[in-house]
Interface confidence: medium
Amino acid sequence: KETAFVEVVLFESSPSGDYTTYTTGLTGRFSRAGATLSAEGEIVQMHPLGLCNNNDEEDLYEYGWVGVVKLEQPELDPKPCLTVLGKAKRAVQRGATAVIFDVSENPEAIDQLNQGSEDPLKRPVVYVKGADAIKLMNIVNKQKVARARIQHRPPRQPTEYFDM
């Protein structure tokens, strides 16, 4: 299980129309459910339940986004509509170039994502927890324009990190 180096870039537009970017670095793990490769895209926060329905929420976004899913405690969803792997697949089917799961409240999901799949996804499926997950969700919950860059080796250039 290789380390995934994730950079989350928050775009703040200035009155002049220019953008200032604030980059936060965090680490996760590439799961065996997906490929160990780099990916980048605009963050789309997805509710685990929102990945259940084959309805209006289908095909909502054009291809190339990074799905962020905060998994709930298993007892809050005792009969999930899809497995965690199924949810990752559904997100990729809808155009996600990568999926990041916050497993802080559902650590069992780590094993589910790492059970060697005969047919792993061709896109990365990363999981984060603890302080890294908190950093990620703090940014995502702002509901502002943000991008995620996932790399399987540390960023070459030193990046300025801002604690969000």
Epitope: Y19, H47, E57, Q143, K144, V145
Partner: antibody, heavy 121, light 108 residues
Framework: EVQLVESGGGLVKPGGSLRLSCAAS????????IHWVRQAPGKGLEWVGR??????????EYAAPVKGRFTISRDDSKNTLYLQMNSLKTEDTAVYYC????????????WGQGTLVTVSS | DIELTQPPSVSVSPGQTASITCSGD??????VHWYQQKPGQAPVLVIY???QRPSGIPERFSGSNSGNTATLTISGTQAEDDADYYC???????????FGGGTKLTVL
């Protein structure tokens, strides 16, 4: 059919109270955050407040003009949302809408037809 | 707190393109949603997250957001598009929804 239906509006005197209801059908109500939005006669839309789903903590948040006077609650077993309005003022006169938010996006994809609240002496 | 400003009215001839703007400081940092409201009816979401169109909304509706201005564009405007249009954003400090003042689109 996905639907929200408000009720409970009417005429009330300044300082009075009123409780609005919003009945949901056609979707799993408990999974969604629901908002109240109002519109004074001939005016624009104004956000009143929201309640998150229970799984998201059931947190309530309010617009400054109604904070401390209005209370939002939900009964997931009855698929119903409530807006308790106390210490009503004439400027609270409006059509009140309940609206469902898309998961994690405070964009409202389903709206009720609205219920008129008139505060007048 | 962000404030959203819309022109009170916009007129367009049938078949032409209508552009309705929504401006606010650093608006490009936010996700902007657009609602259509016809007289006596509840609002309808026509664009969310700057440019996403809900199912059932015609392709002639599109959105963009950059710098300080978000724009709702209706190409090939039809008589049925005659309505009020509101932009909105979610402001996270403090958490609350902010609506623009609304624009009355008149299809001549």
């Amino acid at each position: 059919e996905v639907q929200l239906v408000e009720s409970g509006g009417g005429l009330v005197k300044p300082g009075g109270s009123l409780r609005l209801s919003c009945a949901a059908s056609g979707f799993t109500f408990s999974d969604y955050g629901i908002h109240w939005v109002r519109q004074a006669p001939g005016k624009g839309l104004e956000w009143v407040g929201r309640i998150k789903s229970k799984t998201d903590g059931g947190i309530t948040e309010y617009a400054a003009p109604v904070k401390g006077r209005f209370t939002i609650s939900r009964d997931d077993s009855k698929n119903t949302l409530y807006l308790q309005m106390n210490s009503l003022k004439t400027e609270d006169t409006a059509v009140y809408y309940c609206a469902r938010a898309i998961y994690y996006l405070e964009a409202f994809d389903v709206w009720g037809q609205g219920t008129l609240v008139t505060v007048s002496s | 707190d962000i404030e959203l400003t819309q022109p009170p009215s916009v007129s367009v001839s049938p078949g032409q393109t209508a552009s309705i703007t929504c401006s606010g400081d650093s608006l490009g940092s936010y996700y902007v949603h657009w609602y259509q409201q016809k007289p006596g009816q509840a609002p309808v979401l026509v664009i969310y997250r700057n440019k996403q169109r809900p199912s059932g909304i015609p392709e002639r509706f599109s959105g963009s957001n950059s710098g300080n201005t978000a724009t709702l564009t209706i190409s090939g405007t039809q008589a049925e598009d005659d309505a009020d249009y509101y932009c909105a954003v979610w402001d996270d400090e403090p958490h609350h929804d902010v609506f623009g003042g609304g624009t009355k689109l008149t299809v001549l």
